[in-house]
């Protein structure tokens, strides 16, 4: 069962004091049903699982991907699943940890040890299901080692959000991801209304950035659903 | 300040209805993955379900999977938690969460991080 399967992640999702480290400093909340400890920061119990629901990579952390917790699994349940580390299997890059991407279905060290000037690279983007297998179209595409150590700059070829600088984002661009600007207020964003529907897009927008969110601007809203234009508002 | 509310709890006879609401105030979530999680007398919190921002991935616990249904509006900042055929062991305070946003801000994990104050739901038998 999705539990039992589960369990084994129990304290993945284990915050730090709240209003700590989890970048929201200072913010006032609600904490956890939880202990409390000296100097009044309440920390959630580690009682059992938190899954943390997705559609896609980009709303898991760093250290994970997003994908059905089974095989074969239900298609509508994907939540975030801590990061493949190095020589173990995978199916795309975000599967692998910061360090590493997925080469010939195993993740590998993008250390620049590994590297002998550039590497050439297949860059499988699976159209409609990210996380099917590896069919889909394929593209070469050129990757400099040095993007593994210096965050990419606007333009740069990344695998993941974490390969670019502040404030950009690894997005798709045709058969390749670059890093792109993080979107602000009252820029076009994007709203995957089903699941799956940002593996269509090649030229892919990155989401709102913070205290942003992507909705319907307000003149459009008696427009056709097809033809409602999503801009980045604040909260 | 960030603050989630919960209502729609109360006391209900086994096999009947509730409908749980979790409105976000302040800096709100819908970009966020929000869930609900209950903590019931000398028992740990247990998850209940939760919703990805854009609705399309839902979770369920396997003991509450086919009754419960979580859906959200995002227009109104509101997670809302279905709770259909209940039963005396689905007696509980019932927290909404909200979640982080994952790498969208750089942390390693996408948790939970904002908590509501909880409404009590009650099924008699």
């Known amino acids: 069962t999705l539990n039992s399967v589960l369990n084994s992640n129990a304290i993945k999702n284990l915050p730090p004091p709240l209003g700590g480290a989890a970048g929201h400093p200072g913010s006032a909340v609600s904490a956890a049903p939880g202990i409390l400890y000296p100097g009044g920061n309440k920390y959630q119990t580690i009682d059992n699982y938190q899954p943390y629901p997705c559609a896609e990579d980009e709303e898991c952390g760093t250290d994970e991907y997003c994908a059905s917790p089974t095989r074969g699994g239900d298609a509508g349940v994907q939540i975030c699943l801590a990061c493949r580390k190095r020589r173990k299997r995978c199916m795309r890059h975000a599967m692998c940890c910061p360090g590493n991407y997925c080469k010939n279905g195993i993740c590998v060290s993008s250390d620049q040890n590994h590297f002998r000037g550039e590497i050439e690279e297949t860059i499988t983007e699976s159209f409609g299901n990210d996380h099917s297998t590896l069919d889909g179209y394929s593209r070469r595409t050129t990757l400099s080692s040095k993007m593994y150590h210096t965050k990419g700059q606007e333009g740069s070829v990344c695998l993941r959000s974490s390969d670019c600088a502040s404030g950009l984002c690894c997005a798709r661009h045709f058969w390749s991801k670059i890093c792109k600007p993080v979107l602000k207020e009252g820029q076009v964003c994007t709203k995957h209304r089903r699941k799956g529907s940002h593996g269509l897009e090649i030229f892919q927008r990155c989401y709102c950035g913070e205290g942003l969110s992507c909705r319907i601007q307000k003149d459009h809203h008696q427009a056709s659903n097809s033809s409602r234009l999503h801009t980045c508002q604040r909260h | 300040e960030v603050q989630l509310v919960e209502s729609g709890g109360g006391l209900v006879q086994a096999g009947g209805s509730l409908r749980l609401s979790c409105a976000a105030s302040?800096?709100?979530?819908?970009?966020?993955?929000m869930g609900w999680f209950r903590l019931a007398p000398g028992k740990e919190r247990e998850f209940v379900a939760a919703?990805?921002?854009?609705?399309?991935?839902?979770v369920y616990a396997d003991s509450v999977k086919g009754r419960f249904t979580i859906s959200r509006d995002n227009a109104k900042n509101t997670v809302y938690l279905q709770m259909n055929s209940l039963k005396p062991e689905d007696t509980a305070v019932y927290y909404c969460?909200?979640?982080?946003?994952?790498?969208?801000?750089?942390?390693?994990?996408?948790?939970?991080?904002?908590w509501g104050q909880g409404t009590q739901v009650t099924v008699s038998s």
């Open positions: 302040g800096r709100t979530f819908s970009s966020y993955a």
């Open positions: 969460a909200a979640g982080n946003g994952g790498r969208t801000y750089g942390h390693s994990r996408a948790r939970y991080d904002y």
């Open positions: 919703i990805s921002w854009s609705g399309g991935s839902t």
